[in-house]
């Protein structure tokens, strides 16, 4: 594949990674995939810089991002660190909240109205962040 | 590398109490709910209590309801279980474990409820 | 309560054998479902989670599939260190509740 020098239509450049943001809703499987189908993933906050950027474009709307606990401990879609790494967790979250009723805890992490994050039900259909990063290769076939 | 231990069990009277602490290590504790489950000699697992990460929820079995109290340090990164009016058949290996879906365990520490 | 159901309670089998182990639940959990081993004095291993999903390693002989109340536990090609007791658990709702277990010996 070829390396990715600028960001495809309808996608933000941002600090050498591109994003797009979502206007419907999806639940959070089908977020992941969207963005899988799209050479990307789920967004991944890894400094509060990236956590300004990404909560000025999503605006007060419940939105998902990269990060759940499906198998147990928290992860990153990328595969960044989620111990050493950036954090924002609402006050109290996560909570694994089982009072729903919908079974099962909460395993997927969002963007709250204020930015801060919460673990939710993985099927709620909320809005998604996807992200590329610029100096990836992409998987397209090289020009001949 | 995730790791838990128990301590504080022992020989104990019936009514009496006794309190049991699980250490844990190589995880950012308070983001995961934490359980203590046991097991009766040579009987099968039962769960007992679990907290979640910020203690908002607590849980617990019928059979240690009114008896028993789950609590954590996230500062100090440890589970806790207070045992009062212990009986016979709270006799067993307590076992403190990682989320819901219980990912990871310690190694147990025996209860023995005797007179 | 979820009530849990094991069958069978023990299982006499040999090196080689492809074995299967049912939990059944008494109400749905989709695929709230975990799978353990345990050998005598040893804590409980996870083998599997999410009813389906292999526990990382863990070895591929082990694969459990099931959702809603009929789950199972199916081990390959059994070996030695197979050779333990079973336990299925929920985590749909609360209280959780874990199966009787299944023995696991020599034939």
């Known amino acids: 594949g070829s390396e990715r020098t600028c960001c495809p239509v309808n996608w933000v450049e941002h600090e050498r990674s591109c994003y797009w943001f979502s206007r419907s809703g999806k639940a959070w499987a089908d977020a992941d995939n969207y963005c899988r189908l799209e050479d990307a993933h789920l967004v991944v906050v890894t400094s509060w810089e990236e956590q300004k950027f990404v909560q000025h474009h999503i605006g007060p709307v419940n939105t998902w991002m990269g990060l759940h606990d499906q198998n147990g401990p928290w992860k990153w879609v990328d595969g960044t660190d989620y111990e050493t790494g950036f954090k924002n967790w609402r006050p109290e979250q996560p909570d694994d909240w089982y009072g729903h009723g919908l079974g099962g805890g909460e395993d997927c992490a969002h963007f709250t109205d204020d930015g801060r994050w919460n673990d939710d039900v993985c099927q709620r259909p909320y809005r998604w962040v996807c992200e590329t990063e610029l100096d990836k290769a992409s998987q397209e076939p090289p020009l001949l | 590398e995730v790791h838990l231990v128990e301590s504080g069990g022992g020989l104990v009277k019936p009514g009496g109490s006794l309190r049991l602490s699980c250490a844990a290590s190589g995880f950012t504790f308070s983001s995961y709910s934490m359980n203590w489950v046991r097991q009766a000699p040579g009987k099968g697992l039962e769960w007992v209590s679990s907290i979640s990460g910020s203690s908002s929820f607590i849980y617990y079995a019928d059979s240690v309801k009114g008896r028993f109290t789950i609590s954590r340090d996230n500062a100090k990164n440890s589970l806790y279980l207070q045992m009062n009016s212990l009986r016979a058949e709270d006799t067993a290996v307590y076992y403190c474990?990682?989320?819901?879906?219980?990912?990871?365990w310690g190694q147990g520490t025996l209860v023995t409820v005797s007179s | 309560d979820i009530q849990m159901t094991q069958s069978p309670s023990s299982l006499s089998a040999s090196v080689g054998d492809r074995v299967t182990i049912t939990c059944r639940t008494s109400q749905g959990i989709n695929n709230y479902l975990v799978w353990f081993q345990q050998k005598p004095g040893k804590a409980p291993k996870r083998l599997i989670y999410?009813?389906?999903s292999l526990q990382s390693g863990v070895p591929s002989k082990f694969s459990g599939s099931g959702s809603g109340t009929d789950f199972t536990l199916t081990i390959s090609s059994l070996q030695p260190e197979d050779f333990a007791t079973y336990y299925c658990q929920q985590y749909y709702s609360y209280p959780f509740t874990f199966g009787p277990g299944t023995k696991m010996d020599f034939k």
């Open positions: 999410a009813a389906s």
């Open positions: 474990a990682r989320v819901a879906a219980l990912d990871y």
